[in-house]
Amino acid sequence: GCDRNCGLITGAVIGAVLAVFGGILMPVGDMLIQKTIKKEVVLEEGTIAFKNWVKTGTEIYRQFWIFDVQNPQEVMMNSSNIQVKQRGPYTYRVRFLAKENITQDPKDNTVSFLQPNGAIFEPSLSVGTEADNFTVLNLAVAAASHIYPNPFVQVVLNSLINKSKSSMFQVRTLRELLWGYTDPFLSLVPYPVSTRVGMFYPYNNTADGVYKVFNGKDSISKVAIIDTYKGKRNLSYWESYCDMINGTDAASFPPFVEKSQVLQFFSSDICRSIYAVFESDVNLKGIPVYRFVLPSKAFASPVQNPDNHCFCTEKIISKNCTSYGVLDISKCKEGKPVYISLPHFLYASPDVSETIDGLNPNEEEHRTYLDIEPITGFTLQFAKRLQVNLLVKPSNKIQVLKRLKRNYIVPILWLNETGTIGDEKAKMFRSQVTGKINLLGLIEMILLSVGVVMFVAFMISYCACRSKTIK
């Protein structure tokens, strides 16, 4: 009798020990995970995060769709709606260069760097060549007439526009439109002005920054968050809190991301900080990620979202701040009338697109999203979509703009910048992060469940034996 009872008690004790061990392993394991993650996401030499941060291991592509104007004469002569036809994608590989001038500052636990710009055309991922021609708005004419509303100067500009045989629209190659060309009208200005014009001019051999971000050594909750941009904590483009540089650069976020979080990030492309909210759980190459999206609320007018009041900088084009879905970034573009929106004016008010025919906004194709691995905070997949537009206004002094009867926010192009973790990197991530966490979770669950089952089973057996013996 004793042998059997002792065996049952021993089994129950072993079960209890296993269950307790499994239970203890939960917080202890979480602590170990947190400790490892905290160590590895710090932006300093030797960590996994630092290696991937210096030079992204992911191939990033920027696809362009150009809005080819189908009726230039009709618009110029009759102020008709602009008929556009998008052509693309024309794909470039971007962000392949390592960060430069990386400098750690141990005093305030920050690291500063420059992000060099470079673009390599990918013919195999494009519908045509860089020599393809497009009819687009004349960038210099639209910009000059906006920068110089002065009637006297507009007469001077008109003389130069006419002499150079420039018009409201122009035919340019993809390479010229994106990366720059010498403008014939600006070439006639008898002062030293930049005569090169392009949607992304200058780009190659330039760099974005200097960025100064927290390296996370003192507080992991601050890792990758921007401290200063170009030496300042503010942009000087907007009023009040709209001018603040918030969050990270969206390549990563502080670890242990919660679904309830609002992820703030700064994008120099749009000259502002913006935010993303959780949308859904996604499985990316076997890695569970959270999909965060830019909500329509971020593009709303101050009438719909009072928080956006400081992004409304003028009253006329915005119809007294009631228009939505477009952002006037002229202050950030040396006064050029550049407006940023989502592609095809997704989430924009009808008045914005009423002068343009041929647009088909579509949430799936045209919204921006970030797929974030919640434990590390790394962005493993993203699609940044934006449209660049130029404002053109009537001018009674400039012949080629004289017959316009209304303002146009003219779409020039839209882009889709995407990056997805590669298969090899995903495999490595699964084995090093997801795999280990899953294994630890599995061990915890096995220990706990086996322990509990053993304890309960042996205790029941023991009790049953005891009651038999008593009888």
Partner: antibody, heavy 117, light 107 residues
Framework: EVQLVESGGGLVQPGGSLRLSCAAS????????IHWVRQAPGKGLEWVAW????????YYADSVKGRFTISADTSKNTAYLQMNSLRAEDTAVYYC??????????WGQGTLVTVSS | DIQMTQSPSSLSASVGDRVTITCRAS??????VAWYQQKPGKAPKLLIS???SLYSGVPSRFSGSGSGTDFTLTISSLQPEDFATYYC?????????FGQGTKVEIK
């Protein structure tokens, strides 16, 4: 070095005509456009006429419209002011001046036009 | 036409004085205002354009301010060579118009 030199001023009877010249050097007049500004004795400055760059539009003060004509000969890099039906109130020192954005960065030394019988 | 009203029409000052001349436009001209200095028998000389931008070679004691309709030319410390007549001019709209001038004389 940028220089503007006016000539052609003198004494003329009311109703008469005179042609002023403005010879430019150191820059191309067609790129900038040329203005004529006058100053009656002991009075302030009065803008008279302007020829826009590259032979663009011509503009005149109301007081001279229909009587004065501005022109330019790009081959000679010279601007002209043809003044017809002259009146006593046209008596002034006439300056030619260079401008692109509407302010005058270079001026000639001036030429005196006297309208008197 | 845009009228430019200058005040005062004349002023007396001593070397080293701070001198302020004002100019008012009859309508908004943004920052499209220039200031000139003219000495007897000479052509005017550009001092300031775009209301505040000092022309090259002009001493830094000259400064301009203002926007919209009200503009000011300031000479921080008057020098003997600064005794002259000063004109403002709007370069916003044709016809280009000048103020009637301010004569700065020795006290």
């Amino acid at each position: 070095e940028v220089q503007l030199v006016e000539s052609g001023g003198g004494l003329v009877q009311p109703g008469g005509s005179l042609r002023l010249s403005c010879a430019a050097s150191g820059f191309t007049i067609s790129s900038f456009g040329i203005h004529w500004v006058r100053q009656a004795p002991g009075k302030g400055l009065e803008w008279v006429a302007w020829i826009a760059p590259y032979g663009g539009d011509e503009y005149y003060a109301d007081s001279v419209k229909g009587r004065f004509t501005i022109s330019a000969d790009t081959s000679k890099n010279t601007a002209y002011l043809q003044m017809n039906s002259l009146r006593a109130e046209d008596t002034a020192v006439y300056y030619c001046a260079r401008s692109f954005f509407g302010y005058f960065d270079y001026w000639g030394q001036g030429t005196l036009v006297t309208v008197s019988s | 036409d845009i009228q430019m009203t200058q005040s005062p029409s004349s002023l007396s000052a001593s070397v080293g004085d701070r001198v302020t001349i004002t100019c008012r436009a009859s309508q908004d001209v943004s920052n499209w205002v220039a200031w000139y200095q003219q000495k007897p028998g000479k052509a005017p000389k550009l001092l300031i354009s775009y209301a505040t931008s000092l022309y090259s070679g002009v001493p830094s004691r000259f400064s301009g301010s203002g926007s919209g309709t009200d503009f000011t030319l300031t000479i921080s410390s008057l020098q003997p060579e600064d005794f002259a007549t000063y004109y403002c001019q709007q370069h916003s709209n044709a016809p280009l118009t000048f103020g009637q001038g301010t004569k700065v004389e020795i006290k």
